[in-house]
């Protein structure tokens, strides 16, 4: 039970006090007791329950009421059973007893009131009225945890607007309200109670810029809302009528968890005694609700796809046809960003990452806009954000970004268990340098901080700065699987490729050509590739880099070797010893459920079939996956990217609720 106030009683005059239902009020009977009295007894109205803690009771009176010694060890607490119909309608009488004097009486007139701030602390999607209880003041994780949840109102329900809903202090309509969390203030008081008392709703100054609270005012025609708390307003006096009354508030978060904001927001209602005009208002009671702002959550390749995004650029019609066909097979919506909107920037994966936010009453997809800001920079904000589709961005919006701030360098694993630690929403993966140096690249700290602050997908830092482009999607991917952990990790593997080529040469196919059918491209014989010592040295270096990540992933995701599939791939080292794919990078694939869009490698044709394609199919088809090889050579590969880099996917949110995990 929540702590109420301390009431001091005195024999000199009657004491008037307010007792809030559901709170434990302490009664100080000692400090004003007559000097020659040594004990006291208590009589109460039926609506008051008094509890006296002292063992043993001093003496049982014949009338049936007990007396207790007046000493510091005695604790008198009281609670009320119901709200009062009129002011002071409940009474407590303290009788002080002494050896030589008649009993001295002290009177306490109590007014019982019900004042409670309620929200969906049980996370059921419904607000249940709660009396003042301690639990509302703490937010706990896990299936037995409790505490309310707020969504950042980061969508744009008004198509005419260019701003997110949380950027204005208006409620557009009932649709906008659904993005907010309901909070109800329930009061039950005597009719004249608020002539002498006031309620104030408030939020800490440190949190006022993270939240906005609207009060629903029921008009005759429609339900209107007005801002009562927000970035410019940390407190608001409430006009509450006497009697029984419910007041609804709608709460929206304005900021995601981040470095200096753990995501917790406490809203408090304070009851003030304003009866003495010549004195300052005194706090009589407070009730609080703690909300946690829902984190932004990424979805791995194992989640069902819902929508595919791709750019239309000069001469990529065939690529578009292939992606369209794949999306149809996977029963996905397809969104094509036209040339006039992408400004010749085809790297859809790099511009944005689509995740979601969730509260018990609402789930919202949210696009995380990278700070790379090239030709596609307007696409997330103008075309993706909209009604019930939120938006967030981090990092410098002008300059100061590196290639590692693009979101081809941001992936998430499927759910994993590492030892005793469960990651039911997977773990975020991003690439970094091995160590900081004058020219090393790393993901911008603002992005790293944001990802870590979400708490539910603890990030793992991989090593990707060895690549020309520097993105983790150049050497890893995840595909769904029917067995084991429900997925496989795919890693690009020069070792596997050399092994395959060596086998083909041993079988007499050393003259088979890589890049057959590619115009203006030097075709390479298997035997020449195998005998090129420089290329071998380069791939030996690449293998070491990938192996470093392999061990890191095994450790951080709790994987065994049998959870990993090696995809044959060669790389070449270019300027400044940075690596890029020697032939189209097959691991950089589009995963749409069981349908995979894999860059066509243009490997050596043996017995009428590309040996690289054949090898990959033999590795993935037993998992029930369907491989489609997409020609991206001229439009993507030679521009340092592949199918995954050129596409993006919105996926179905996890069925697992983030608040049920323990980070």
């Amino acid at each position: 039970m929540a702590q109420g106030t301390l009431i001091r009683v005195t024999p000199e005059q009657p004491t008037h006090a307010v007792c809030v239902l559901g709170t434990l009020t302490q009664l100080d009977v000692c400090s004003s007791a007559p000097e020659d009295c040594t004990s006291f007894s208590v009589n109460t109205s039926p609506g008051v329950v008094v509890d006296i803690a002292h063992s043993p009771p001093a003496k049982k009176k014949s009338t049936g009421s007990s007396t207790w010694p007046l000493d510091p060890g005695v604790e008198v607490t009281l609670t009320m059973k119901a709200a009062s119909g009129s002011t002071g309608d409940q009474k407590v009488q303290i009788s002080y007893h002494g050896p030589k004097t008649p009993p001295v009486k002290a009177l306490l007139y109590l007014t019982g009131v019900e004042i409670s701030l309620s929200a969906d602390i049980t996370r059921t999607g419904k607000v249940k009225p709660t009396r003042a209880v301690e639990d509302k003041r703490t937010w706990t994780w896990g299936p037995c945890g409790q505490g309310a949840i707020l969504l950042v109102n980061c969508d744009r329900d008004n198509p005419e607007s260019s701003a997110m809903d949380c950027e204005d202090d208006e409620v557009l309509d009932s649709k906008d309200l659904k993005d907010m969390s309901l909070m109800t203030l329930s009061t039950k008081t005597p009719q004249d109670f608020f002539t002498r008392h006031t309620l104030v709703l408030h939020v800490a100054r440190s949190e006022m810029d993270k939240v906005r609270v609207f009060q629903a005012t029921r008009g005759r025609l429609s339900s209107r809302c007005r801002v009562v708390l927000g970035p410019k307003q940390p407190s608001h006096y409430l006009m509450v009528p006497g009697g029984k009354h419910n007041m609804d508030f709608y709460v929206e978060a304005l900021a995601f968890p981040d470095t200096n904001f753990p995501g917790l927001i406490t809203l408090t209602v304070s009851m003030l005694d304003t009866s003495k005009l010549e004195l300052p208002e005194a706090v009589v009671f407070q009730d609080s609700v703690v909300f946690r702002v829902a984190p932004w959550i990424m979805t791995p390749n194992t989640q069902p796809p819902q929508e595919v995004y791709v750019c239309s650029i000069f001469e990529n019609e065939d690529f578009l046809k292939s992606v369209t066909a794949l999306a149809m097979q996977a029963r996905c919506k397809l969104t094509i960003c036209p040339e006039e909107e992408n400004m010749d920037d085809q790297w859809m994966q790099d511009e944005m990452e689509i995740g979601y936010i969730q509260a018990p009453h609402k789930t919202l997809p949210v696009v995380f806009d990278s700070p790379r800001n090239r030709g596609l920079k307007e696409f997330p904000i103008k075309r993706v954000m909209g009604p019930d589709f939120g938006y967030v961005t981090r990092g410098p919006q002008t300059g100061g970004v590196s290639g590692l701030d693009s979101f081809g360098n941001l992936e998430v694993s499927p759910p994993v268990t590492v030892g005793d630690k469960e990651y039911p929403l997977g773990r975020i993966l991003f690439g970094d340098s091995c160590y900081p140096s004058s020219d090393s690249r790393e993901m911008h700290q603002a992005l790293q901080d944001f990802l870590s602050a979400q708490q539910v997908q603890a990030p793992v830092k991989l090593y990707s700065d060895w690549l020309t482009v520097g993105h983790v999607d150049e050497f890893l991917s995840f595909v769904p699987a029917p067995d084991r952990k429900g997925f496989r990790l795919l890693l690009a593997s020069p070792r596997s490729c050399y092994k395959l080529f060596q086998e083909q040469q041993n079988e007499g196919h050393g003259d088979a050509l890589l890049f057959q059918g590619i115009k203006k491209k030097n075709q390479q014989k298997i035997k020449n590739i195998l005998s090129n010592t420089t290329l071998r040295e380069h791939n030996s270096f690449v293998e070491r880099c990938i192996d470093w990540n392999r061990e890191l992933l095994k450790r951080e995701l709790g994987l065994a070797e049998s959870d990993i599939i090696d995809i044959p791939q060669l790389f070449k080292l270019k300027e400044f010893s940075k690596a890029e794919a020697f032939f189209p990078n097959m691991v950089n694939m589009l995963v749409l459920g069981k349908h995979l869009g894999i860059p066509k490698p243009f490997g050596p044709i043996i017995n009428g079939r590309c040996c690289l394609e054949e090898k990959v199919c033999s590795l993935l088809e037993p998992l029930g996956l369907h491989c489609t090889f997409i020609n991206d050579f001229y439009t993507y590969h030679i521009r340092h990217g592949e199918v995954h880099c050129g596409t993006n996917v919105r996926r179905k949110p996890f069925s697992f609720k983030w608040w049920n995990m323990v980070p």
Partner: antibody, heavy 128, light 111 residues
Amino acid sequence: QVQLVESGGGLVKPGGSLRLSCAASGSTLSDYFVSWIRQAPGKGLEWVSFINAANTFTYYADSVRGRFTISRDNAKNTVYLQMNSLRAEDTAVYYCSSANDDVDDIVAPGRGYYMDVWGRGTLVTVSS
Amino acid sequence: QSALTQPRSVSGSPGQSVTISCTGTRGDVGRYNHVSWYQQHPGKAPKLIIYNVYERPSGVPDRFSGSKSGNTASLTISGLQAEDEADYYCSSHSRSSTPVLFGGGTKLTVL
């Protein structure tokens, strides 16, 4: 063959800023590595900065790191050199130079380390 | 002071050969085959004449040749002609935090 034209030079006070542009014609700059090299009056060449064709990494000389930023806008076929906190010793003719990033190369061709096309240069004078 | 060391000046008569040296360290010239040479006439932009130690861009006469031994690279101009009079700069990729280094330049005078 690509042609390069530098612009944006001029007189600036110490501590000031300038942005140099290197505009390309005759070819798509996105296929090229681009470097800035400078030459102080009567002195030798000094390599300043580099950006790769894929626009994914940059390098700087110790003398300018933290003050200069190289960037490219492939849609505008232009590379920029943003120069902040300029000092008297930054006074020089600034040349933009490029080398084609040939995807056919099997192994490191070193194209990022040499400059086969040069602009005419733009003079930057830092003086109070 | 430049990172790569070149002689201040060399000279030769028309028809003769001259060699310009460029000395670096094990971390640049000695480590990489990414040495290039540039010719610069007064008031003009430099022009690439040798790259990757000994390769010549198209249009550069075969009188210009490059080589490397240990930490020293060399440019040899045979059959000197009057128009060869210019400043010559060597350059190399480097392991240092400045990844491309130039020599101080050599003034070639054709007598």
